[in-house]
Amino acid sequence: IWELKKDVYVVELDWYPDAPGEMVVLTCDTPEEDGITWTLDQSSEVLGSGKTLTIQVKEFGDAGQYTCHKGGEVLSHSLLLLHKKEDGIWSTDILKDQKEPKNKTFLRCEAKNYSGRFTCWWLTTISTDLTFSVKSSRGSSDPQGVTCGAATLSAERVRGDNKEYEYSVECQEDSACPAAEESLPIEVMVDAVHKLKYENYTSSFFIRDIIKPDPPKNLQLKPLKNSRQVEVSWEYPDTWSTPHSYFSLTFCVQVQGKSKREKKDRVFTDKTSATVICRKNASISVRAQDRYYSSSWSEWASVPCS
Amino acid sequence: RNLPVATPDPGMFPCLHHSQNLLRAVSNMLQKARQTLEFYPCTSEEIDHEDITKDKTSTVEACLPLELTKNESCLNSRETSFITNGSCLASRKTSFMMALCLSSIYEDLKMYQVEFKTMNAKLLMDPKRQIFLDQNMLAVIDELMQALNFNSETVPQKSSLEEPDFYKTKIKLCILLHAFRIRAVTIDRVMSYLNAS
């Protein structure tokens, strides 16, 4: 058993049929010695008396808010949560496996630039009685500071019969140099509590590996005389690291109709303009990627050919 | 310590092309190592990230773009002195700081070159003959060093009398390649910045 936060405790349980469970001793936070009784949740049934209460925690029915009273007055609370371990593996029931970039990916993180700011998100099908707490650091043995905000519900989607909820959090490394060469990864730890179930999820990464620039901005078309060719120009996204001559991007320019199966024109360039062939009912799209370290491509920025 | 926006002579900054080749060569070599040593811990997640130049050179700090010198987190106090001549200095107006940056890059390359050559000598003794260093990568390191053209004492190639542990050598190769790729990215960014200045 360990303390998650004040008056909230996590009991780690090996979860299998007829498991013996874990013996837990609760102590009432009071100077009083006599006349103390214990109850669980909203029940008025007295579980025991005395300053300490010993319980055998085996299942979710044994978890919950234990309260010690004296003469009708509440003295203190202890909330017990369960953390299940099945076949030596901690449970991951609360969050959905996003399976990208690999199986058992529960947290996904992206950064728009090298400033040390990044966003992580996760998915769940659970809609109520759900709380998240996020901590982060650079390295684990001698951790350097990363400050994370509160996790918020950022999107709701319908997937078949289920509703899916996306939560996200923004974090900022306390003293980040955009030009630095990372040797210690960022560690992100998410505590998830659903009703009386506790789970924790972690992700470890270098900012350089989670870079995904914003799409190029200000796409403009200029038809070339006596030609089917069009000059398309654009600018670096505002959120990209500066100077751009140091943090350079490379671009992919594509002309395509509405269907992915349609024919297309595609060209890669390090410049902020390119010449392509425009077709009726097609659109020109441009995306960006770090020129020197191939992490993710940005989303497409598009304009219609016409 | 930073790179002032110097005004090199018009035309291609002499080292930009070589640095692009360097990044390409080390990326290819790393990819080859990951594929060949698939049953060894050779991915970014599996290895320890070590920097053999730590406390010996200060390329990131010495080559910091002027725009980032206002960022407190970028200003590291490490002091290192370097020789200040070199043919990549495309203009007489080039500052002392730029010379410091380029000589730091030269020292990096020299250290990695020694490490890679020592390692290759060990890998050539491996009866499995599983992996060797790409000669092209070694040649590209050499070309960039020649383009930088700094005079400095030659570092003797390390020779080891004990029987090499090939497993350890291959893991060390992965560590070295990952670190060198990151440094090659920095070098490419620096050359691109200098070329644009």
């Epitope: 089917r228 060719q229 490379t250 199966r261 349609e262 024919k263 297309k264 024109d265 595609r266 060209v267 890669f268 360039t269 390090d270 010449t275 062939i277 077709r279 009726k280 | -």
Partner: antibody
Framework: QVQLVQSGAEVKKPGSSVKVSCKAS????????LHWVRQAPGQGLEWMGW????????EYAPKFQGRVTITADESTSTAYMELSSLRSEDTAVYLC???????????WGQGTLVTVSS | DIVMTQSPLSLPVTPGEPASISCRAS??????LHWYQQKPGQAPRLLIY???QSISGVPSRFSGSGSGTDFTLTISSLQPEDFATYYC?????????FGQGTKVEIK
């Protein structure tokens, strides 16, 4: 299976014209760009131009501009390349090629030898 | 027009040995570079597109690398059926242009 089948060899007099055909099978004809590339005996490859069979748009290499015409007939899934004012240096194997991507070629015809000789 | 220069023009190789062909562009073409194989009397066959992207059905011994102006086609271990002429082609701008070709011959 996508295939491009070209017309047979031709012998032409200098100053005349030649029209080579390229019939496509497998896949929808208008879903692909169609190019013509030539190869002189023992020489390399030389791109001549492309057509979008969907709308008849064409683009030609400056070297052949004014002498080459590429057309397409959607009803028969056939593309044509006509080269006029032939000279002896136009003796070559003419290849058609296609792709959903405009700028490179993933399926080629077998080639048509055009000999220009007086 | 962008001029593509291949080297060497002839490459004698022992079967089972690796082979590398170089292609240089007269100006930077990013990764807009494709490789073809051509055997006598046959049409070319696409091997690699956009400098390093492999084609399904093409043996994994063929790989491409490079960007900017310098590109390489590598055959890790030459098989008897790989003796042919190889061409690079740029697609950075029209007109599309090819290298002169490199003939890989049996040593």
């Amino acid at each position: 299976q996508v295939q491009l089948v070209q017309s047979g060899a031709e012998v032409k007099k200098p100053g005349s014209s030649v029209k080579v055909s390229c019939k496509a099978s497998g896949g929808t004809f208008s879903d692909y760009y169609l190019h013509w590339v030539r190869q002189a005996p023992g020489q390399g490859l030389e791109w001549m131009g492309w057509i979008d069979p969907e709308n008849g748009d064409t683009e030609y290499a400056p070297k052949f501009q004014g002498r080459v015409t590429i057309t397409a007939d959607e009803s028969t899934s056939t593309a044509y390349m006509e080269l006029s004012s032939l000279r002896s240096e136009d003796t070559a194997v003419y290849l058609c090629a296609r792709n959903k991507e405009l700028r490179y070629f993933d399926v080629w015809g077998q080639g048509t030898l055009v000999t220009v000789s007086s | 027009d962008i001029v593509m220069t291949q080297s060497p023009l002839s490459l004698p190789v022992t079967p089972g040995e690796p082979a590398s062909i170089s292609c240089r562009a007269s100006q930077s073409i990013s990764i807009n570079l494709h490789w073809y194989q051509q055997k006598p009397g046959q049409a070319p066959r696409l091997l690699i597109y956009f400098a390093s992207q492999s084609i399904s059905g093409v043996p994994s011994r063929f790989s491409g690398s490079g960007s900017g102006t310098d590109f390489t086609l590598t055959i890790s271990s030459l098989q008897p059926e790989d003796f042919a002429t190889y061409y690079c082609q740029q697609s950075n701008s029209f007109p599309l242009t090819f290298g002169q070709g490199t003939k890989v011959e049996i040593k």
